[in-house]
């Protein structure tokens, strides 16, 4: 058993049929010594008496809010949550496996630049009685500070018969050095509580590996005289790290016909302009990637040829 926060405790249980469970000793936080009784949740049924109460925790029916009283007055509370371990593996019932980039990916994180700011998100099909708490650091043995905000519901989607809820959190490394080579990874830890079930999820990464620039901005077409060619121009996204001479991007320019089956023409360039042939009813799209490190491409920025 360990303390998650004040008056909230997590009991770790091996989960199998007829498991013995865990003996837990609850102590009433009071200078009183006599006349103390204990109840569970909203029930007025007395479990027992004494300043300490020993309970055998085996299942979710044994978890909940234990309260000690004296003469009708509440003295203190202890909320017990359960963390299940089945066949040596901690349960992952609360969050959905996103399966990207690999199986057992519950947390996904992205950064728009090298400032030390990043966003993580996760999915669940649970809509109520759900709380999340996020902590982060750089390194784990001698951790350096990363400050995370509160996790918020950022999207709701219908997937077949189920509703899926996306939660996200923004974090900022306290003393980030954008130009420095990373030697220690960022660690992100999410505590998830659904009713009386506790689970924790972790992710470890270097900022350089989760970089995904915003799409190029101000995408414009300039027709070239007496030609089907156009000059496409764009700018670095506002969110990208500066100076651009050091934090450089490379770009992919794509000409795509109306039909998905039509052949795509692609040009790769380090410049912020390119000359392409603009076919009727086609569109031109541009995306960006870090020039010196192959992390994710941005989403496409697009304009129609016409």
């Amino acid at each position: 058993i360990w303390e998650l926060k004040k008056d909230v405790y997590v009991v770790e249980l091996d989960w199998y049929p007829d498991a013995p469970g865990e003996m837990v000793v609850l102590t009433c936080d009071t200078p009183e010594e006599d006349g103390i009784t204990w109840t569970l949740d909203q029930s007025s049924e007395v479990l027992g008496s004494g300043k300490t109460l020993t309970i055998q925790v085996k299942e979710f029916g044994d978890a909940g809010q234990y309260t000690c009283h004296k003469g009708g007055e509440v003295l203190s509370h202890s909320l017990l949550l359960l963390h299940k371990k089945e066949d040596g593996i901690w349960s992952t019932d609360i969050l959905k496996d996103q399966k990207e980039p690999k199986n057992k990916t519950f947390l996904r994180c992205e950064a728009k630049n090298y400032s030390g700011r990043f966003t993580c998100w996760w999915l669940t099909t649970i809509s109520t009685d759900l709380t999340f708490s996020v902590k982060s650091s750089r390194g784990s043995s001698d951790p350096q500070g990363v400050t995370c905000g509160a996790a918020t519901l950022s999207a709701e989607r219908v997937r077949g018969d189920n509703k899926e809820y996306e939660y996200s959190v923004e974090c900022q490394e306290d003393s980030a050095c954008p130009a420095a080579e990373e030697s220690l990874p960022i660690e992100v830890m999410v505590d998830a509580v659904h009713k009386l079930k506790y689970e924790n999820y972790t992710s470890s990464f270097f900022i350089r590996d989760i970089i995904k620039p915003d799409p190029p901005k101000n995408l414009q077409l300039k027709p070239l005289k007496n030609s089907r060619q156009v000059e496409v121009s764009w700018e670095y996204p506002d969110t990208w790290s500066t100076p651009h001479s050091y934090f450089s991007l490379t770009f992919c320019v794509q000409v795509q016909g109306k039909s998905k089956r039509e052949k795509k023409d692609r040009v790769f360039t380090d410049k912020t302009s390119a000359t392409v042939i603009c076919r009727k009813n086609a569109s031109i799209s541009v995306r960006a990637q870090d020039r010196y490190y192959s992390s994710s491409w941005s989403e496409w920025a697009s304009v129609p040829c016409s």
Epitope: T37, L40, E45, V46, L47, G48, S49, I55, Q56, K58, E59, G61, D62
Partner: nanobody, 115 residues
Amino acid sequence: EVQLVESGGGLVQPGGSLRLSCAASGFNFSNYRMYWVRQAPGKGLEWVSSIGAIGNVPAYADFVKGRFTISRDNAKNTLYLEMSSLKVEDTALYYCARDYQGVVRGKGTLVTVSS
């Protein structure tokens, strides 16, 4: 009429074990949290252990310290108390009760721990 009949008490040496039983009748046993309470010679009634209606939250007094195990069999309307590592100070009349104060209880079974 509510009836609670305890059995299984006796004389045992320190460190020994006993299993107490309590046969319940006259009420819907499976709907009630059940309790064991005890009264040592010349002392007041003392709560020992309790167990929820569906077997959840077995709870124990501090002095039990993992030595006693409470259980129930709702099909047989029977409550049990497995007692091990018995000490001289566990000597008492043990009652099965339907409330933690022992208002509704049986006649008791005597447990004597002595060398």
